[in-house]
């Protein structure tokens, strides 16, 4: 193991605690340790040990309480089906290795629901859904026996119940008891049996959480009836006067640690962003807790529905805020949520019964003080009149999601707190904060949002193209003349926006190479569309050798791009996508977007440059206020423009100007950056406002970017607001919703 055998801060020696085939890491300042095994293996007989007051580590005990001398990493197996009703499965085996498959078939007269074939996965779980053989005879459909569980009860009439159990040493997640309800659905959620080493993968969590959250947010019309036995989706009438409160509850206790706390904050920022992308504006409550809770945002505050403001409050919270009182009092934290939900003088306000409440609790597990938090969940249910009226149980008005992070999570506790709803998962156990961050990046990135413009995967594991998924590399091969390199931006599934000067009229489509997403292969080009007013020789007679007005072109691709995490479009001005990205009202006009993105001041922006085969973001300021004139006047220092009497001859209203040393020293563009996007980063989204066109000084003469550059080193970019009619005409079939 990588640890020295010196005593940790706790009082337990590390001698003899090693695990065969794996390693261990200390937790809670040496008061606990976690065994870590390679993928496909689990620590036997336990995953964690605690340092006892006697100065020895807790004993290595198997599930049937036998003592083991040394821990070891054993191959993960998937559980066998204890029972399978009304059918057969094959092959039969006492246990199954990773990547083993089983198949299910039903007896005559029974129909298979769920997955006919399932594969044993590396986390010890079976792929797919529970296989169920049903003949449709019950009022409710057969709820099935998830692999690894045992079911008691085989009558599926209205109000009949079934109960589930797990083998010794396994923890039941989900509902132990399910009842056949009016309408043909089962109460609660499907159970599963969890071993302590089992974690949900980020992908599983993202999918399950998102599909449940989407149900909550989007709702479906309650008029859609369904017959008995059909799977019932949650149905909520979205009353326009109804609303939604989301309570974010974050464990800030000792055991969490500062970097995990920061990670959890990132997750919640992504969650707020995700919810905003659905176009809903819930009110947020924000609570962190250790020994005591601290309310940072109350749902009653005026700004609690302003996602940007809530994000700002969240980002300003410090882990140190709970340093002096660092126990884990989950009950008190939930009481803080209860206090936000309840109303003064116990007089319910108008519309209280149309507000849906979502609690999202992130914790590393054990509440060690304050008593059982489940009692508060019961009080909240009472307050919201949930589960009291059989005809209208109002279960849809409360969702409690619990994210357990790390090895110390008590699965029984977190399962008790979480909501249990049919076909939904509300409790998640992830390996570590990195995995939880993955969840929220995946969640923001699920396929529905792939077409959202200006979205990036800002994850620590992200590649250059995860972080700049719109960036395109363009090269033009000219026989006997070498080749020209440019950049561009993906603006739709068929188009890349770039600079017109990257091409000459003689360039043939087959000599133009475009690549996106960091892929090696080049895309086939159908045509390059130049702005009709672009004419590099347009002012030769007036002694202006090169004239870059309207220096924009669109490359139309032969085949549709397949959007993914490393290929997606940037937002264009005056489109509906940008209205949504900036969270502006749907009635926003083009003029209003212009005022939002290009106000008359210095505007923080960025461009993407390639340095030593890596894409890097360079922060610049667009001089659009009092520095605009001096920025534009520096164009006279450009080669060939020294004799120009009136600088507006070359710097037309189509240009934006960056560079220089005020308000900050801006980095400059290089030749190969031409055609790339000039971007404004706002509300966690990226909107292209310009196309890089030309620069006053070549700061990259010898393949290296000069560090010291003169103050007059300015760069000029075509302002996309000034070529909108052309963009709109050429992209009119691309569904971008130009305003």
């Amino acid at each position: 193991t990588p640890w020295s055998l010196a005593r940790p801060q706790g009082s337990c020696s590390l001698e003899g605690v090693e695990i065969k085939g794996g390693s261990f890491r200390l937790l809670q300042e040496g008061q606990a340790l976690e065994y870590v095994c390679p993928s496909g293996f689990y620590p036997y007989p336990v995953q964690t040990r605690t340092c006892r007051s006697t100065g020895s580590w807790s004993t290595l005990k198997t599930q049937d309480q036998k003592t083991v001398r040394k821990a070891e990493c054993r191959a993960i197996h998937c559980p066998r089906p204890h029972d399978f009703e009304n059918g057969e499965y094959w092959p039969r085996s006492p246990y199954y290795n990773v990547s083993d498959e089983i198949s299910f078939h039903c007896y005559d007269g029974y129909t298979l629901r769920g997955s006919a074939n399932r594969t044993c996965q590396v986390n010890g779980r079976w792929s797919g859904q529970t296989a169920i053989c049903d003949n449709g005879a019950g009022y409710c459909s057969n709820p099935g026996i998830p692999i690894g569980t045992r079911k008691v009860g085989s009558q599926y009439r209205l109000e009949d119940s079934v109960t589930y159990h797990c083998s010794r040493g396994l923890t039941l997640r989900g509902s132990q008891r399910r009842t056949c309800q009016e309408g043909g659905s089962w109460s609660g959620t499907e159970p599963s049996c969890q071993d302590s080493f089992m974690y949900d993968t980020p992908q599983e969590v993202a999918e399950a959480f998102l599909s449940s959250l989407t149900e909550t947010i989007e709702g479906v019309d309650a008029e859609d009836g369904h017959g008995p036995g059909e799977q019932q989706k949650r149905k909520i009438v979205l009353d326009p006067s109804g609303s939604m409160n989301i309570y974010l509850v974050l464990d800030g206790s000792d055991s969490i640690g500062a970097s995990n706390f920061t990670g959890a904050k990132k997750c919640l920022v992504n969650l707020i962003e995700k919810v905003a992308s659905y176009g809903v504006k819930p009110r947020y409550g924000l609570v962190t807790y250790a020994t005591y809770p601290k309310i940072w945002v109350k749902v009653s505050e005026a700004d609690s529905s302003n996602a940007d403001w809530v994000t700002k409050q969240l980002n300003e919270i410090n882990y140190e805020d709970h340093k002096l009182k660092s126990g884990t009092n989950t009950k008190k934290a939930l009481q803080a949520v209860y206090s936000m939900m309840s109303w003064p003088d116990d007089v319910p306000p108008e519309g209280w019964n149309r507000t849906r409440h979502v609690i999202i609790l992130m914790t590393d597990g054990l509440h060690n003080m304050g008593g059982d938090p489940i009692t508060v969940i019961d009080e909240i249910r009472d307050l919201l009149y949930i589960g009291k009226d059989r005809k209208n149980p109002r279960e849809d008005y409360l969702d409690v999601y619990v994210f357990g992070v790390g090895p110390l999570v008590n699965q029984v506790n977190i399962n008790a707190l979480a909501s249990k709803k049919d076909n939904e998962q509300h409790v998640f156990k992830v390996k570590d904060m990195e995995n939880l961050e993955d969840v929220f990046y995946q969640m923001i990135d699920e396929s529905q949002s792939l077409s959202l413009c200006g979205m990036v995967w800002e994850h620590r594991k992200g590649t250059d193209y995860h972080k700049q998924p719109w960036q395109a590399k363009i090269s033009v091969i000219r026989p006997s003349k070498g080749h020209e390199s440019c950049m561009g931006a993906v603006v739709s599934e068929y188009f890349v926006l770039t600079a017109a000067h990257c091409f000459t009229v003689d360039d043939k489509e087959h000599s133009i190479k475009v690549s996106v997403g960091g892929e090696k292969r080049d895309l086939e080009i159908e045509v390059v569309l130049f702005h009709p007013n672009y004419n590099i020789n347009g002012k030769k007679e007036a002694g202006i050798p090169e004239f870059y007005d309207y220096d924009v072109a669109l490359i139309k691709l032969k085949n549709k791009l397949k959007y993914g995490q490393t290929i997606r479009p940037i937002c264009l001005p005056c489109t509906e996508g940008t209205t949504r990205a900036l969270r502006l009202p749907p009635t926003t006009t083009c003029q209003q977007q212009k005022e939002e993105l290009l106000p008359a001041q210095d505007i923080k922006a960025l461009f993407v440059s390639e340095e030593e085969k890596k894409l890097t973001r360079k922060e610049v300021y667009i001089k659009n206020g009092d520095k605009k004139g001096s920025c534009e006047r520096d164009a006279q220092y450009a080669p060939g423009y020294d004799k120009v009497k009136d600088i507006s001859e070359v710097v037309t209203p189509r240009f934006l100007c960056t560079g220089g040393v005020s308000p900050y020293a801006d980095p400059n563009t290089c030749r190969g950056d031409s055609g790339g996007p000039l971007i404004v980063h706002k509300r966690s989204r990226f909107i292209q406002v310009g196309v890089i066109s030309w620069g006053v000084v070549d700061v990259c003469k010898n393949q290296k970017r000069q560090k010291q550059v003169p103050a007059h080193a300015r760069d000029f970019h075509i302002n996309l607001f000034q070529v909108l009619p052309w963009l709109k005409e050429k992209l009119q079939d691309e569904d971008l919703g130009f305003l």
């Epitope: 009709p532 007013n533 083009c590 003029q591 209203p653 000034q722 009619p725 919703g737 130009f738």
Partner: antibody, heavy 121, light 92 residues
Amino acid sequence: QVTLKESGPGILQPSQTLSLTCSFSGFSLSTFGLGVGWIRQPSGKGLEWLASIWWNDDKYYNSDLKRRPTISRDTSNSQVFLKISSVDTADTATYFCVQIPYGSRNGFDYWGQGTSLTVSS
Amino acid sequence: GDRVTISCSASQGINNYLNWYQQKPDGTVKLLIYYTSSLHSGVPSRFSGSGSGTDYSLTISNLEPEDVATYYCQQHSKLPWTFGGGTKLEIK
């Protein structure tokens, strides 16, 4: 307030070139998001958009027309021009000049009263 | 005093980018409704527009003598911008 006024020759012979002028006031064609367009209406028939010019000098034409007109502007004198070469009797119509704010959600806000053109030999 | 509805059908979806114009017998043209249902400034509230996809309509809820005119719809979704053939409204 915004006003637009069209002027033209009134009568032309086939194969001659039509030159129309739209003089406007109350706005500037260098203002972001503004454009001016030409629309015509043959007597007793419907309206047909011909061409538009925008604040940034972008020009757009009706691609369904047999002969493409030419639109241009003189921003400092608040004028927009339309030329159609080699007219024939099918070009007999009333020609309107309109102000167009940029954007799909906008209509032709302000119309001139129109100038009549007859093409006959 | 009557209520009248004039319909306009597009050959393909136009995303609500539809405008209505009124041309009086003397030839003057005015914008009434833009973006399917937004009332242009100065237009009486008895005029209203609705529709989506390919089918749109203009409704005059309480007909006045001065509403005698020809009404044109116009799509602003894709170039070339096109007008409908016009509907002439007369009062009995």
